[in-house]
């Protein structure tokens, strides 16, 4: 008995598409072995039509594909533009065609449903609008017009020109009689339901001279598009519902059991807690289309998603919809990276961001997710030397360690830095990842003076105290600029006396600026790293002033000025326009993506992502 399973019979009609899913035990060998779809010949052989190794028979060219979903133990054969010639016996299987790891499938393609003569066929998607046109002759111009639906053997009145409307159609049907020149009336039904499908009869007049026209209404429920994305990666659902619903509330929901479709996000401001920090609903175009981006994909995100339009912002009967079946591949190419990073007020965090290593030359970005309205992600820094003004001196994006990971360092942390941040590039859009920064109780580990003033032409020495826990780390000083932080020479001055209960392994490392010039003014960071992996940093602003009295300045912790007040966000800021988040190529060339006006917000409350993958910041 073969362990492969699938549909034994598939029945369809000419011109249609079929999507045949074959199930196999998801062992390691099975997941990676060849998958095939072959047609059984009269003499017992089976001729391959398509396989997972890229082969496509000329009979299937341009109309079929085979997709393997190893995590689920399934593969799917899609065949479009069916003809009666496609009827026959097939096998879906694994390995070699003749080896028996297969399942027999009978495909029968018929000519299509038999219809009454002179029947007009209307094929319309669920939730959309249909207009059934009913011609009549002059003698019936003044007579009653009506539309009936055939229910079993009996015609049931749906609507007529005297004002009757069948209760099943209330609020979504109208009968239009064209001007006197046209001998035609129309019945318009919107918010189509599956139950609306069937045979209709329109009639002008009620006697033996009445004009009749048959109509066959087929209401199509969208077959889910199969979407297969990597764990920890990103997915974008593009939803095009048509201009007729351009002004209706849009939603994305995820089907749970039965009819329930739990709203994930909608344009009325609702967002499911599980997607906090990792979802954007991109604003709709004039044609009513929109898209939803979800990052940091989890195993439990897999399932069936519907997008639609309804004034309630949720799925209702008659909502026009699109459907997707999302599979989340746990054998992900996207490496694990902490989803939560913790830092203390005044301290720092170093965030590792994965990217597709094949795209090392891509532009790297870091943005701050904001939940207001439908969510957006204003850009904070990029790898081309742009830093948002209010983050100058405390934010840097470094290409290190490279080979598929870049680093973002943020220091001088305050409670307002708590929130969700996205790592992304202008390359592979599937590699968007999310990290939550949490501000916890504690003191920064590195101790530096607050603001420091240097005197032109003199020497300045700035201390940085490293506790013993960093004894094995490389210690450095660097000067911050918007392209990174350029390393500077520094001196180890021996053990630090700034820490209680810290032995000889603590260190005082000083930065010395000789013959200070105006160019020395700016932000300086001291920090620790191990190889290309960065740890904590502390920032000092050095101001330069004219000489008042001779001598050199040696700054101690006690003499240092108070830490500068935190800069308040100003109103002009760069934001990834939602289109650009969807496809960062849109802003690869132009730095000023959008100059939206925004007010400084208050402290951002953060929502725990429930992840165990946490990375400590300044306090461990």
């Amino acid at each position: 008995k073969s362990p492969i399973f699938g549909p034994e019979e598939v029945n369809s009609v000419e011109g249609n598409s079929v999507s045949i899913t074959c199930y196999y035990p998801p062992t390691s060998v099975n997941r990676h072995t060849r998958k095939y779809w072959c047609r059984q010949g009269a003499r017992g052989g089976c001729i391959t039509l398509i396989s997972s190794e890229g082969y496509v028979s000329s009979k299937y060219a341009g109309r079929a594909n085979l997709t393997n979903f190893p995590e689920n133990g399934t593969f799917v054969v899609n065949i479009a533009q069916l003809s009666q010639d496609d009827s026959g016996r097939y096998k879906c299987g694994l390995g070699i065609n003749s080896r028996g790891l297969s399942f027999d499938v009978s495909l029968e393609v018929s000519q299509g449903p038999g219809l009454l003569n002179d029947t007009k066929v209307y094929t319309v998607d669920l939730g959309r609008t249909v207009t059934i046109n009913c011609p009549f002759k002059t003698e019936n111009a003044q007579k009653r017009k009506s539309l009936y639906k055939q229910i079993g053997l009996y015609p049931v009145l749906v609507i007529d020109s005297s004002g009757y409307v069948n209760p099943n159609y209330t609020g979504r049907i109208r009968l239009d009689i064209q001007g006197t020149g046209q001998l035609l009336f129309s019945v318009v039904i919107n918010q189509l339901r599956l139950s609306d499908a069937g045979q209709y009869l329109c009639q002008a007049g009620d006697d033996s001279n009445s004009n009749k026209k048959n109509a066959d209404l087929q209401v199509l429920k969208p077959e889910p598009e199969l979407v297969y994305e990597d764990l920890r990666g990103s997915v974008t659902f593009h939803c095009a519902l048509g201009p007729e619903v351009a002004n209706v509330a849009k939603f994305l929901c995820r089907q749970s059991s039965g009819e329930n479709c739990d709203v994930v996000v909608n344009t009325l401001g609702k967002r499911a807690p599980a997607f906090e920090g990792r979802i954007l609903l991109n604003p709709q175009d004039k044609d009513g289309s929109f898209s939803v981006v979800i990052t940091g994909l989890r195993k439990e995100d897999a399932g069936r998603y519907l997008c639609g339009a309804h004034s309630d912002g949720q799925l209702q009967e008659g909502s026009p919809i699109q459907a997707w079946q999302l599979f989340v591949n746990e054998e992900s190419t996207i490496p694990r990276s902490p989803t939560v990073v913790k830092g203390v007020a005044g301290g720092s965090v170093a965030v590792l961001c994965p990217y597709n290593r094949k795209e090392s030359k891509s532009i790297k970005y870091w943005c701050l997710w904001e939940g207001a309205q439908n969510g957006r992600c204003p850009l904070l820094v990029d790898s081309e030397g742009w830093v948002k003004a209010q983050y100058e001196g405390r934010l840097s994006l470094l290409e290190e360690p490279g080979n598929g990971t870049f680093t973002v360092i943020l220091n001088q942390l305050t409670s307002r830095d708590a929130g969700f941040y996205w790592c992304l590039t202008n390359g592979d859009t599937l590699w968007r990842t999310t990290v939550e920064i949490k501000i916890i109780e504690g003191e920064p580990n590195l101790k530096v003076p607050g603001n420091v003033t240097a005197v032109l032409g003199e020497t300045l020495k700035v201390p940085c105290h490293f506790p013993c826990k960093f004894s094995s780390y490389e210690k450095y000083w660097c000067k911050w600029n918007n392209t990174g932080c350029q390393a500077l020479p520094s001196q180890d001055e021996g053990p630090s006396k700034a820490f209680v209960n810290c032995d000889e392994n603590s260190r005082l490392v000083s930065l010395t600026l000789n013959l200070v010039t105006r160019a020395d003014e700016g932000w300086y960071w001291c920090g620790v790293k191990q190889g290309h992996f960065y740890g904590e940093t502390a920032a000092v602003y050095v101001a330069v002033e004219e000489r008042k009295a001779a001598g050199s300045r040696d700054v101690s912790l006690a003499k240092a000025d108070a830490a500068p007040d935190e800069k308040v966000l100003d109103s002009g800021f760069r934001e990834i326009e939602n289109k650009a988040i969807q496809d960062p190529r849109l802003f690869a060339e132009e730095k000023a993506v959008a100059d939206t006006r925004d007010q400084a917000d208050g402290s951002r409350a953060s929502v725990d992502s429930g992840s165990s993958e946490e990375q400590g910041g300044s306090s461990r």
Epitope: N11, V13, N16, V18, Q218, L220, K221, E259, R304
Partner: nanobody, 126 residues
Framework: EVQLVESGGGLVQAGDSLRLSCAAS????????MGWFRQAPGKEREFVAT??????????YYADFVKGRFTISRDNAKNTVYLQMDSLKPEDTAVYYC?????????????????WGQGTQVTVSS
């Protein structure tokens, strides 16, 4: 809410036939597939057959033990699914349950089905 009502069960001799019906009522949007499962005394509920549809395309799935003997079909207009059972055997004795799902998933998986009928008893005597 969708209600499923099974009928057509009964007591028959081995080799005889029975036709089970499952009528769906209530809000049937957007049902994806309907199927039959069975549960013999002291055994777990098991998959028998499922029919899935999309527009004018339909897919029929069967358990190995019923292949060639049972046929699943549906009447779209009546929202009804049938299970024609031929060449019945004593081991086919069980309560037969109708189930419906809206999810695209393995049709054999019990947990894929959100809606269940009360069941109809089929007894096959030797």
């Amino acid at each position: 809410e969708v209600q499923l009502v099974e009928s057509g069960g009964g007591l028959v001799q081995a080799g005889d036939s029975l036709r089970l019906s499952c009528a769906a009522s209530g809000r049937t949007f957007p049902t994806y597939a309907m199927g039959w499962f069975r549960q013999a005394p002291g055994k777990e509920r098991e998959f028998v057959a499922t029919i899935r549809w999309s527009g004018s395309t339909q897919y029929k799935y069967y358990a190995d033990f019923v292949k060639g003997r049972f046929t699943i079909s549906r009447d779209n207009a009546k929202n009804t699914v049938y299970l024609q059972m031929d060449s019945l055997k004593p081991e086919d004795t069980a309560v037969y349950y109708c189930a419906a799902t809206t999810l695209l998933t393995d049709p054999r998986a019990l947990n894929a089905y959100a809606y269940w009928g009360q069941g109809t008893q089929v007894t096959v005597s030797s």
